[in-house]
């Protein structure tokens, strides 16, 4: 099958993942796009944890991941229930900004120079991290 | 080495189909995706289609959507093209490549002609 | 979709010479861009990828630069070899799509 039993190169295992942290930047579908053809996904925070192993590697700069509103609600791209998962916004985030000029609020959620998380508008130019599971078969113990 | 082998062009007429394959050698196939180049005779190139490595996940030109379709067999480290409602405006020079990571294309193939004419 | 133009779509040099091609994209890409050359009848080999980034086993009298809508290929003395047609591509968003090429020939 297409299951991964370890990280391809150059990405970085933590947790049974396997992510990749971009040194360009793309407009958040862009981003979605090139993840999807990794057979992988943007990131999905789900823990602090893994919030501030993101965070270390991304260092402060604007980063996309995949949490977006653009189809009414907040969702993460790979089904996590958002209402009930981890969050890390910003005080006052995320407010659907129109100010900004470029038409429209702010659908997209990225890490922000100090890791929290802000919604902006999802044309703006950012890196992004993708993220992939490894095989789950592969994180059974062997039988004895 | 590295190689990618096109084949499977020739002559069609139009409304035809066609199956164009491309076998890859010397990297793991499976871990990169792949995809589908075309060049009509005199012309430039235009990009035709995308192929995740495990398969998941495709995209297409808006010219071939709905025609083409990519595919892969990762066991015979195998690419495919599916064309099917052949236009003459297909007619071009087929190359398959490897995608790198900058998302720009590394390896190619020799190229297969698809010709589509009455 | 982004559409790629190229400068000039020819040019007659010589050996030695300081070629320079141009490359524009409709909206910004940030630098994700690569070059390809291509000889009559063979496939195409990239040369640049990552705006400025050199290909593995390529020359270095190429080299590539720019970022957001401007890109420039740069043949520091052109060779015999270099005698070709050369193409950028845009890798930013789907689909991707190549310059139009421009052809080098001999002077």
């Known amino acids: 099958g297409s299951e991964r039993t370890c990280c391809p190169v150059n990405w970085v295992e933590h947790e049974r993942s396997c992510y990749w942290f971009s040194r360009s930047g793309k407009a958040w579908a862009d981003a979605d796009n090139y993840c999807r053809l990794e057979d992988a996904h943007l990131v999905v925070v789900t823990s602090w944890e893994e919030q501030k192993f993101v965070q270390h590697h991304i260092g402060p700069v604007n980063t996309w991941m995949g949490l977006h509103d653009q189809n009414g609600p907040w969702k993460w791209v790979d089904g996590t229930d958002y209402e009930t998962g981890f969050k890390n916004w910003r005080p006052e985030q995320p407010d659907d900004w129109y100010g900004h000029g470029l038409g429209g609020g702010e659908d997209c959620a990225h890490f922000t120079d100090d890791g929290r998380w802000n919604d902006d508008v999802c044309q703006r130019p950012y890196r992004w991290v993708c993220e992939t599971e490894l095989d789950k078969a592969s994180q059974e113990p062997p039988l004895l | 080495e590295v190689h990618l082998l096109e084949s499977g062009g020739g002559l069609v007429q139009p409304g035809g189909s066609l199956r164009l394959s491309c076998a890859a050698s010397?990297?793991?196939?499976?871990?990169?995706?792949m995809s589908w180049v075309r060049q009509a005779p005199g012309k430039g190139l235009e990009w035709v289609s995308i192929?995740?490595?495990?398969?998941?996940?495709?995209y297409y030109a808006d010219s071939v959507k709905g025609r083409f379709t990519i595919s892969r067999d990762n066991s015979k480290n195998t690419l495919f093209l599916q064309m099917n409602s052949l236009r003459a405006e297909d007619t071009a020079v087929y190359y398959c490549?490897?995608?790198?990571?900058?998302?720009?294309?590394?390896?190619w193939g020799q190229g297969t002609m698809v010709t589509v004419s009455s | 979709d982004i559409q790629m133009t190229q400068s000039p779509s020819s040019v007659s040099a010589s050996v030695g010479d300081r070629v320079t091609i141009t490359c524009r994209a409709s909206?910004?890409?940030?630098?994700?861009l690569a070059w390809y050359q291509q000889k009559p009848g063979k496939a195409p080999k990239l040369l640049i990828y990552?705006?400025?980034s050199l290909q593995s086993g390529v020359p270095s009298r190429f080299s590539g630069s720019g970022f957001g809508t401007d890109f420039t290929l740069t043949i520091s003395s052109l060779q015999p070899e270099d005698f070709a047609t050369y193409y950028c591509q845009q890798a930013n968003s789907f689909p991707f799509t190549f310059g139009p090429g421009t052809k080098v020939d001999i002077k």
């Open positions: 909206q910004g890409i940030s630098d994700w």
């Open positions: 490549a490897k995608r790198t990571p900058s998302d720009a294309f590394d390896i």
């Open positions: 010397g990297f793991t196939f499976s871990s990169y995706a």
């Open positions: 192929l995740s490595g495990g398969g998941k996940t495709t």
């Open positions: 990552a705006a400025s």
